[in-house]
Interface confidence: medium
């Protein structure tokens, strides 16, 4: 003989009874009548349950809650089912024998029968687990029933403290749906808050769990499938203030089937969201977006921001969001960088594009622009890179595409090529009034549109000139000299320790800023416009350190222990970390800081000039850094202001050395035996480049690299080509992660080396 | 006078081992990579192996690589080459060479400045 | 690493011009832009004369310029001299803390 062996299945549910009605008391659990109520209504499930075949299986039950409307009672029960047969009784098959015993003409005196008349249509069965029960139990000392009427906002009030862990039960209208708001109002916190697409923290119904005060996302609104929902908040410290602001709606449910008819032309025409967008969407969410395009001359491009598509085994859900395009089934996953699907028009014109969300975990709400593209060339002058559908640069010696195809099969890599007999040159060369090749190709087309390309400048009419660099040389090039617009930069004022480096003399470096906090000099930084500093966004990582109002900016400084009449000091009123950055990878490190108030410039307060993004530094060349970083590896910030040049390194040296760890949006400069180099404290400040017409150009932002000064490896900069349309974008008011901005990180404040 | 000179050539048997030195002088040796090339009887130049000028930084050529060690002493101005398990194909006239410019963080991979070179034969 | 390919000889008249070719892969002469030519005469140790494909070390005769097309790069001489022939080597760097050279082309000034 041998024991049967068993195991506990837990479920969840809920049930509605008819001629019994919710009061304000059956909504306090430690209300007499809870009480009275709870264990009557606990006898009736066990005898539904005991009436049934799952009756011989019976172990223990609860009703732990009661709702609104025709009384809903909430409730869990434990079945020790034979290991055999686990499988064999999922929620549904459950459901259906208790529906059928509530149905049936049974002549039973039991009080589910007699008592109360349950509604076999509300009745509700989810799978639920023993730790899903000890999470309910350790909540109901804080156990909060609230039914969310049409129109009104709930504030939902912490944890006291006396209790760690709070549970809400939030109810609704049955054709509304539950939206709970969460706002964050401290820098610090161990909180957690974990929201259930049930009325119990059930993990399988789990939308979305937060830990810490997420500077990524200051403000979250979180959408339940339906008109229930479960919030848990479990404090982590002990604490007088709650460091976040709850509060919960009921909305209608939003619609998202579209048709959309696209224009010929190849701008962006529009966008595709998820309900209630930047909202997380929801567990139910089905949106299917059907665009049709003019012609099949073109394909149809989808923009994606910080969330990529890729293709998943179909055993495989997907976690976050289930997209369809053309009988294609794609998974969503969020990323940390841009990416574009672009859909090929074939046979016909029109695409359904259809997004699920396949479990109750969710995420941010999706936003996706569209766009057309020409099919016979999606690029014009760059490449198509398929890994990620962007167009990049091609072989100007910069590994844009995750599988290096760009840089592939190049014929000239960073240098221009003779259209007579394919040789290269270098691009300073080209448009110098001076032949290079063979029969003057590099002279050719110096004064009239070309077609755009890597190197090609681009202005503001969007036609392209060939010679490179044209901004601010003092020659118009472009039809509508936009090449010699917003020219007041990168002149220095008054004259003509960052490691290895000499002291700057006042107005050398009218761009420079100094980034304090109490008084005490953090980062560095530049002027690029007369409200706007740029700088490393790695400056911001730590909790301490996340609010603009901690910062000072000090422009034309010269000293740290002491003032001088060039010198300004400004407030921080906004901050923008570019959305992309990647603590861990130091990619994406810029930052952008609106002052306060605007800049009067002087011959010790300018802006640097911003560089194009088809701006070439040429390897080789000598730039300059300043800051006032320390003058040795571990030492102390410097004083003065230091300056030292640097020369700029080829990428592929640079990432050999680094083991490939250097991104597309970075640069290398320094030495082979280092010596001379950024270091702690010169964090965001500058690397400038002098370009011919005597203007300083602003190449790079000092961002990381392996010790200071350490032979064998040089310093690493934020490239400022690869982020300058951003930069532009949050310049002109086009957003970008304002306020908070990027992740919720923990690091040093300032030049990361290692 | 910028001036290399190779020695520690000679005839030997195969399997065995040799030491190459290379002395610089007229010049700041810790400030250039440094590098050996061969070449056997008419034949063309053979790149062996490079060091960069603070010993942190080693390549070599397929052929001699797990064999050959490349090694440099920057106090006394010397760069050496230990050969072992030495092959009849090693046979051949050994320069050493310096890496043209001592400024940049990368090389230019290119030799400015030679020696005379050191002939190793390999033979039974 | 497989050697970069050269012409074994290429000639010249006194006073003409001579381009000498040296194919390389993608990974080599076709990625990096560290192309070097060196020049030798016999018994000789070799002298560079071109180096970043089309960079002249002071004291190497304007005459001398170098190219490069794809993963091939070239070396041309202009106004052939007496003095010019001699045997000349192309180099490349190939990734990895590794050099490559040509197999060489003799270079022969006629009459």
């Known amino acids: 003989y041998k024991a049967e062996v068993t195991v506990s299945q837990v479920y969840s549910g809920s049930l509605r009874v008819l001629n019994r009605h919710f009061s304000q008391d059956l909504g306090r659990r430690e209300s007499i009548a809870f009480r009275s109520e709870s264990a009557k209504a606990q006898k009736m499930l066990q005898e539904l349950v005991a009436s049934t075949r799952l009756g011989t299986y019976y172990n223990s039950s609860s009703v732990y809650s009661f709702g609104e409307g025709p009384l809903t009672c909430f409730f869990w029960f434990i079945l020790d089912i034979p290991e055999y047969q686990r499988l064999t009784l999922s929620p549904e098959v459950v459901r259906e024998l208790l529906v059928d015993e509530l149905l049936s003409n049974s002549s039973t005196l039991a009080s589910y029968k007699t008592e109360y008349e349950v509604d076999p249509e509300g009745l509700v069965i989810l799978e639920a687990s023993v730790n899903d029960i000890v999470v309910l139990n350790s909540t109901l000392g804080c156990y909060r029933y609230s039914y969310v009427n049409p129109g009104q906002v709930l504030p939902l009030k912490g944890p006291d403290q006396q209790t760690t862990s709070c549970l809400w039960h939030l109810q609704g209208p049955e054709d509304l749906m539950i939206k709970v708001r969460l706002e964050w109002t401290r820098v610090d916190c161990r909180d957690r808050v974990a929201m259930y697409d049930a009325a119990g923290p059930l993990e399988k119904r789990l939308i979305t769990s937060v830990y810490g005060c997420s500077r990524q996302e200051p403000v979250m609104e979180v959408l339940a499938s339906g008109s229930v929902m479960a919030v848990v908040w479990k404090k982590g410290m002990h604490s007088y203030y709650d460091p976040f602001l709850l509060s919960v709606k009921s909305v209608a449910f939003q619609d998202c089937q579209v048709n959309l008819t696209l224009e010929g032309r190849l701008d962006t025409q529009g966008f595709l969201r998820t309900p209630y967008y930047p909202s997380y969407y929801s567990p139910s969410t089905h949106c299917s977006w059907h665009l049709t395009v003019p012609s099949l001359d073109y394909g149809l491009a989808l923009w994606f921001d910080a969330y990529a598509l890729r293709r998943q085994k179909y055993n495989r859900l997907c976690t976050q969001g289930q997209w369809m395009i053309q009988n294609r089934r794609l998974c969503g996953f969020r990323t940390l960088q841009p990416y574009a699907e672009r859909i090929p028009m074939v046979a016909s014109d029109g695409v359904t594009i259809n997004f699920t969300s396949q479990i109750s975990l969710t995420g941010p709400g999706v936003q996706v622009y569209y766009s057309l593209y020409n099919q016979s060339d999606p690029c014009p002058g760059e490449f198509l890179c398929s890994v990620n559908g962007l167009c990049v640069p091609a072989c100007d010696g910069i590994k844009d595409c995750p599988n290096g195809l760009d840089e592939r099969n190049c014929v000239c890599r960073a240098m221009f090529q003779c259209q007579e007999d394919s040789t290269c040159i270098s691009l300073p060369r080209v448009c110098d009034r001076q032949p290079d090749c063979l029969n003057g190709s590099d002279e050719e087309q110096c004064q009239e549109g070309v077609p755009c390309g890597t190197f090609t400048f681009q202005c503001e009419d969007r036609s392209c000139v060939k010679k490179p660099n044209p901004e601010c040389d003092g020659q118009s090039d472009c039809r509508d000299g936009s090449d010699e617009q917003h020219c007041d930069c990168g002149l220095q004022g008054l004259s003509s320790r960052i490691v290895g480096g000499t002291v700057s003399s006042e107005g050398e470096w009218p761009w420079q800023a100094s980034l304090q906090i109490r008084g005490r000099h953090i980062c560095g930084g530049a002027l690029i416009a007369d409200r706007w500093v740029i700088t490393a966004a790695h400056c911001f990582q730590e909790d301490s350190m996340a609010s603009p109002k901690l910062w000072t900016v000090f422009l034309g400084k010269m000293r740290q222990n002491s003032r001088w009449p060039g010198e300004v000091s400004f407030k921080v009123s906004r901050l923008f970390l570019h959305p992309y950055h990647e603590e861990d990878s130091h990619d994406y490190d810029v930052a952008l800081l609106q002052l306060d108030h605007p800049v009067v410039y002087s011959a010790t307060v300018r802006p640097v000039c911003l560089p194009a993004r088809s701006h070439f530094f040429e390897p080789g060349q000598h730039c300059w850094i300043t800051g006032w970083g320390a003058q040795r590896e571990g030492g102390p910030v410097s004083n003065t202001l230091q300056k030292v040049d640097v020369q700029l390194v080829p990428q592929d040296l640079c990432s050999e050395a680094y083991r490939y760890q250097v991104s597309p949006r970075m640069l290398c400069a320094g030495y082979r035996k280092g010596k001379k180099d950024a270091c702690q404290g010169d964090s965001g400040g500058p690397l400038v480049c002098r370009e011919p017409s005597g203007r300083w150009f602003l190449a790079g932002l000092v961002s990381w690299g392996l010790g200071c000064g350490r032979p064998n490896f040089f310093g690493v900069y934020t490239r400022v080509t690869r982020v300058i349309n951003w930069i532009q974008q949050v310049l002109t008011g086009g957003g970008g992660s304002g306020g908070g901005g990027s992740h919720h990180h923990h690091h040093h404040g300032s030049h990361h080396h290692h | 006078e910028v001036q290399l000179v190779e020695s520690g050539g000679g005839l030997v048997q195969p399997g065995r081992s040799l030491r190459l030195s290379c002395a610089a002088s007229g010049f700041t040796f810790d400030d250039h990579v440094m590098y050996w090339v061969r070449q056997a009887p008419g034949k063309g130049l053979e790149w062996v192996s490079g060091?960069?000028?603070?010993?942190?930084?080693?390549g070599y050529a397929d052929a001699v690589k797990g064999r050959f060690t490349i090694s440099r002493d920057n106090a006394k101005n010397v760069l050496y080459l230990h050969m072992n398990s030495l092959r009849p194909e090693d046979t051949a006239l050994y320069y050493c060479?310096?890496?043209?410019?001592?400024?940049?963080?990368?090389?230019?991979?290119?030799?400015?400045?030679w020696g005379q070179g050191t002939t190793v034969t390999v033979s039974p | 690493q497989s050697a970069l390919t050269q012409p074994p000889s290429a000639s010249g008249s006194p006073g003409q011009s001579v381009t000498i070719s040296c194919t390389g892969t993608?990974?080599?002469?076709?990625?990096?832009?560290?192309v070097s030519w060196y020049q030798q005469h016999p018994d000789k140790a070799p002298k560079v004369m071109i180096y970043?494909?089309?960079k002249r070390p002071s004291g190497v005769p304007d005459r001398f310029s170098g190219s490069k097309s794809g993963n091939t790069a070239s070396l041309t001489v202009s106004g052939l001299q007496a003095e010019d022939e001699a045997d000349y080597y192309c180099s490349s760097y190939a990734g990895s803390n590794k050099v490559v050279f040509g197999g060489g082309t003799k270079l022969t000034v006629l009459g």
């Open positions: 060479a310096r890496e043209k410019d001592g400024d940049f963080y990368y090389n230019y991979f290119v030799m400015d400045v």
């Open positions: 060091i960069s000028w603070n010993s942190d930084t080693i």
């Open positions: 970043e494909v089309s």
């Open positions: 993608s990974s080599d002469v076709g990625f990096y832009n560290f």
